[in-house]
Amino acid sequence: VPRWRQQWSGPGTTKRFPETVLARCVKYTEIHPEMRHVDCQSVWDAFKGAFISKHPCNITEEDYQPLMKLGTQTVPCNKILLWSRIKDLAHQFTQVQRDMFTLEDTLLGYLADDLTWCGEFNTSKINYQSCPDWRKDCSNNPVSVFWKTVSRRFAEAACDVVHVMLNGSRSKIFDKNSTFGSVEVHNLQPEKVQTLEAWVIHGGREDSRDLCQDPTIKELESIISKRNIQFSCKNIYRPDKFLQCVKNPEDSSCTSEI
């Protein structure tokens, strides 16, 4: 008799999830000498232990603590790049500007980037059919709680000038409900962080509006200022030229605004 299985609204666990996590861990520790001590099998066991046999709507940050401990990593706290709704460009940037780091440039972020996972209460099975959707089902699901946990820790570690890349093409350039707006902003430490500098990325077409004057950016400035952190903002009018100038800063065309 086939066992009844909970149907969730979101996509199921990414196929070959255990193999993918393990392979990513091995690859990451090979590339990053400072993480060579990490035992990837233990990392997978801790990852699995966070959600296997647990109800996928009842996951807590506590469930991920063993994984967090194993994945502890020191990144230069003054070289942190946060992002919201513009992941690809942020990652292209840190691939060129190698001394800056997004969350996905850390071991734990790298392991989970673009993956989905969940288990089932009281069975050791991974659910490849469906997983809870944050909006339609529940917010305390394995994926959301993971990103909330690692994002909080990443923001807490930041110091000096923290940069954030924001998508100027969206109706809400700063969205209070995004991970950046709901987690990272509130976990920057005022005693360590001097300034949050926003880079507002214009979309496929430059326009002459100063998107730093957008009401949602003013809202971000207000939240940050109330936390005794300074705020600054720059328009990136041409993301293609911006990346080009990061690669070749001595290029003569890189003296003008980008």
């Epitope: 496929g204 430059e206 326009d207 002459s208 509006r209 328009n235 009018y237 003008s256 605004e257 980008i258």
Partner: antibody, heavy 114, light 110 residues
Framework: VEESGGRLVTPGTPLTLTCTVS????????ISWVRQAPGKGLQWIGS?????NTYYATWAKGRFTVSKTSTTVDLKINSPTTEDTATYFC?????????????WGPGTLVTVSS | AQVLTQTASSVSAAVGGTVTISCQSS????????LSWYQQKPGQPLKCLIY???TLASGVPSRFKGSGSGTQFTLTISDLESDDAATYYC??????????FGGGTEVVVK
């Protein structure tokens, strides 16, 4: 916005047209140059944005140069040919949810003839 | 390169009638709505009638209506008046800050 500088020139003699703006700032507005040959339709040449970045129609690259000061936008016809005979307009480009050329000058006539 | 095509070079209708001018783009305009409409009369500056595909410009009578999205757009002029006799152009804005104009449609009011 108002264009000036249109006149009769011989082929190959560079010519600069000027668009003078008032009532708004070029630091947060884009200006486009558009031309219209006698009896023909409108043709977009290129634009300059608040940032100073310039963009050109494929056919116009190398043939025209757009630049600006705080209150003027220039269009240089680098090496005019008879095909460049037209009325040249400058227009302000609206942004975001109000995209369009919302303010036009009366135009300035350029005649290229030997 | 992006091409804007206004299929009819001329349309005519009687006073009080309706004319429809179409504008087709070879590729989607930016955000599917970077399309505007203009009226040109001899000896007068060009006038923007519709911006962002469907928004009526200030001071333009509601008889003018813009519609469409992506690659297909229409300007409809209803309750035609003799003063509406003019040439009408569409203009499109594309990704990468490229713009273009349609070939124009002359409206003749009988």
């Amino acid at each position: 916005v108002e264009e000036s500088g249109g006149r009769l020139v011989t082929p190959g003699t560079p010519l600069t047209l000027t668009c003078t703006v008032s009532g708004f700032s070029l630091s947060n507005n884009a200006i486009s140059w558009v031309r219209q040959a006698p009896g023909k339709g409108l043709q977009w040449i290129g634009s300059i944005y608040g940032s100073g970045n310039t963009y050109y129609a494929t056919w116009a690259k190398g043939r025209f140069t757009v630049s600006k000061t705080s209150t003027t936008v220039d269009l240089k016809i680098n090496s005019p040919t008879t095909e460049d005979t037209a009325t040249y307009f400058c227009a302000r480009e609206g942004a975001g949810s109000s995209w369009g050329f919302n303010l036009w000058g009366p135009g300035t006539l350029v005649t290229v003839s030997s | 390169a992006q091409v804007l095509t206004q299929t009819a070079s001329s349309v005519s209708a009687a006073v009080g009638g309706t004319v429809t001018i179409s504008c087709q783009s070879s590729e989607s305009v930016y955000k599917n709505n970077y399309l505007s409409w203009y009226q040109q009369k001899p000896g007068q500056p060009l006038k923007c009638l519709i911006y962002s595909a469907s928004t009526l410009a200030s001071g333009v009578p509601s008889r003018f209506k813009g519609s469409g999205s992506g690659t297909q757009f229409t300007l409809t002029i209803s309750d035609l008046e003799s003063d509406d006799a003019a040439t009408y152009y569409c203009a499109g804005g594309y990704s990468g800050n490229i713009n273009g104009f349609g070939g124009g449609t002359e409206v003749v009011v009988k």
